[in-house]
């Protein structure tokens, strides 16, 4: 069990020419909201499948009214996180779909209008319990910036939130690195609250506020290894002689990072991201100043301006972390566009593009939708080697720049008169015919043979409310 969390940072016109000024341009006031859908796996063929992992809806954003002469401000967005609870194991690989909807509040013929402004889809691998992942996605002329993470709840642990156990509050015969764990049962009592920063993995307490160390660990917060032990050689889920539980596939279980550090899993190990003022494998070293040389990999150390941070490291390109201790995972910046696969070769980045895309960053759409703007709310549809615009109601032409004349094709049958309307057409049928296109003859007894669609008009009644 756990929860997937999504935070929208910004939504607005993307860079470049042809970007809309705002989502409410010339339409009166509107407000935005977001819908998120989670599907398991990475396959694209499931585009029409339900949101099997769950879905969530943001609150409505504040009402936004464009001021014609004023510079476009940041769009007011809904407050808070979007949270999608999941009951079962976190799958690790998933598809994330974020829809941005516009609700128009002005008076329109036909009532309030609702429009899907943008839909972005990301196929990702993500371990539960990891840090926030940031992303920027473009959908047509719009740009969406967001962060997301998955975290376990209800005493579940591990990268898939599948292990259910709780640390005992008393010491045991386990050796260093092996923590005792009780099954999740009613008699499992919650441990007392230990001293702040006390290692959840190597420390314990019997009284609130203390921090006593398991064998093999020392220091005020039980974060410093003391000595090795024969117990370390154990493998498998448990030792029959000691009843000790070997830490499983989740090295971050219990958060080995002290002093508020956050843990992220690496193959077979873990890595701590330390807050300012702390460093070391588990963020256990503190009280550091620039004189101690805390910035690695050529980082420039600057004395901190506030008491909480004795120094700040300005990292050179390619490195990050509070001590410049981490090499930047350049693929985490998602440089490959349009769903391309990123490969960090060390000396260079390479993008393996999906079918239909090319270029160093997969930025060229072979179907020619890239860089092709469809006007008046139209959306570009790929296929056939050329771009095609699916136009909004009332517009037509290659780029949706032409006002569509829906009557040009003479759609009203049997001599019906066609009238153009802002959102389509209406037919005024000749006597003896009915239907939205005057396609049905009225039977002599006044009853028509209707299809599954709704009936149209009585003879001579213009259908004004379409």
């Amino acid at each position: 069990a756990g929860v997937f969390e999504l935070q929208i940072h910004s939504f607005g016109p993307g860079p470049g020419p042809g970007a809309p000024r705002s989502p409410c341009s010339a339409r009166g006031p509107c407000r935005l909201f977001f819908r998120v859908c989670l599907k398991p796996g990475l396959s694209e063929e499931a585009a029409e499948s339900p949101c099997a992992l769950g879905a969530a809806l943001s609150a409505r954003g504040p009402v936004y009214t464009e001021q014609p002469e004023a510079p476009a401000p940041d769009l007011p967005l809904p407050n808070g996180l979007l949270q999608v609870p999941f009951r079962d194991a976190w799958p690790g690989t998933f598809s994330l779909i974020i829809e941005t909807w516009r609700e128009e509040l002005g008076d329109q013929i036909g009532g309030p209008a609702w429009s899907l402004l943008a839909r972005v889809t990301r196929r990702r691998r993500l371990a539960a319990g990891g840090p926030w992942a940031r992303d920027i996605q473009r959908a047509g002329a719009w740009e969406l910036r967001f962060s997301y993470r998955a975290r376990c709840e209800l005493l579940a642990v591990g990268t898939a939130c599948t292990r259910l156990c709780r640390p005992r509050s008393a010491p045991s015969r386990c050796g260093p690195g092996l923590r005792p764990c009780a099954p999740l049962e009613d008699e499992c009592e919650a441990p007392p609250v230990c001293r702040a920063g006390c290692s959840l993995e190597h420390g314990f307490c019997e009284q609130p506020g203390e921090c006593r160390c398991l064998e093999g660990w020392t220091g005020p917060l039980c974060t410093v290894p003391a000595s090795t032990s024969s117990c370390l050689g154990l493998r498998g889920p448990s030792s029959a002689t000691t009843g000790c539980l070997v830490p499983g596939p989740g090295p971050c279980d219990g958060n080995p990072c002290a002093n508020g550090g956050s843990c992220s899993e690496t193959p077979g190990s873990f890595e701590c991201t330390c807050p300012r003022g702390f460093y070391g494998l588990r963020c256990e070293v503190s009280g550091v100043t620039c004189a101690d040389g805390p910035c690695f990999n050529g980082g420039l150390c600057v004395g901190g301006a506030d008491p909480d941070s004795a120094y700040i490291c300005h990292c050179p390109p390619g490195f990050q972390g509070s001590n410049c201790e981490k090499r930047v995972d350049r693929c985490s910046l998602q440089p490959c566009r349009n769903g391309g696969l990123c490969l960090d070769l060390g000396h260079a980045l390479r993008c393996r593009c999906r079918a239909g895309f090319a270029g160093p960053r997969c930025e060229h759409n072979l179907d020619d939708c890239a860089g092709r703007a469809c006007a008046n709310g139209g959306t570009c549809v790929e296929g056939g080697g050329a771009h095609r615009c699916s136009c909004a109601l009332g517009f037509g032409g290659r780029d949706c720049r032409e006002r569509a004349d829906p009557c040009a094709a003479r759609p009203c049958a049997h001599g019906g008169r066609c009238y153009a309307h802002f959102s389509g057409l209406v037919c005024a049928c000749a006597p003896g015919y009915m239907g939205s296109r005057c396609e049905f003859p009225v039977h002599p007894d006044g009853v028509s043979a209707l299809p599954a669609a709704p009936p149209g008009l009585r003879p001579g009644d213009p259908q004004r409310y379409l």
Partner: nanobody
Framework: QVHLMESGGGSVQAGGSLRLSCVAS????????MGWFRQAPGKEREGVAF????????YYGASVKGRFTISQDNAQTTVYLQMSSLKPEDTAMYYC??????????????????WGQGTQVTVSS
């Protein structure tokens, strides 16, 4: 494609009540809006009541506001129209409509791509 099935129509005296149901099947997870239109003999189609599924927002035509209530079930696959204080002018064929479109005007039939066969409501004085 979404398929719709209405039920609950019938005859009732003025001042009485009826409850219409519309069950959607098929690709119901794509539903954005559902609601009811009605058409009386010799009159144009009229929007009655709608619920935008993506938000749960409800809308009512001016002639039924305060008398009719639209609601949906937890699975968001069935909508109900509770009609109270019925009047003779409510007599019409009532059609359930659903939209899976990315753009729609709530009371505009063009925005709805799935329709039921209709159920007759007759109110006598």
């Amino acid at each position: 494609q979404v398929h719709l099935m209405e039920s609950g129509g019938g005859s009732v005296q003025a001042g009485g009540s009826l409850r219409l149901s519309c069950v959607a099947s098929g690709n119901t997870y794509r539903l954005n809006s559902m609601g009811w239109f009605r058409q009386a003999p010799g009159k144009e189609r009229e929007g009655v009541a709608f619920i935008v599924m993506i938000r749960g927002t409800t809308y009512y035509g001016a002639s039924v506001k305060g008398r009719f209530t639209i609601s949906q079930d937890n699975a968001q696959t069935t909508v109900y129209l509770q009609m109270s204080s019925l009047k003779p002018e409510d007599t019409a064929m009532y059609y359930c409509a659903a939209s899976t479109k990315d753009q729609f005007y709530v009371f505009n039939p063009i925005g709805y791509d799935s329709w039921g066969q209709g159920t007759q409501v007759t109110v006598s004085s």
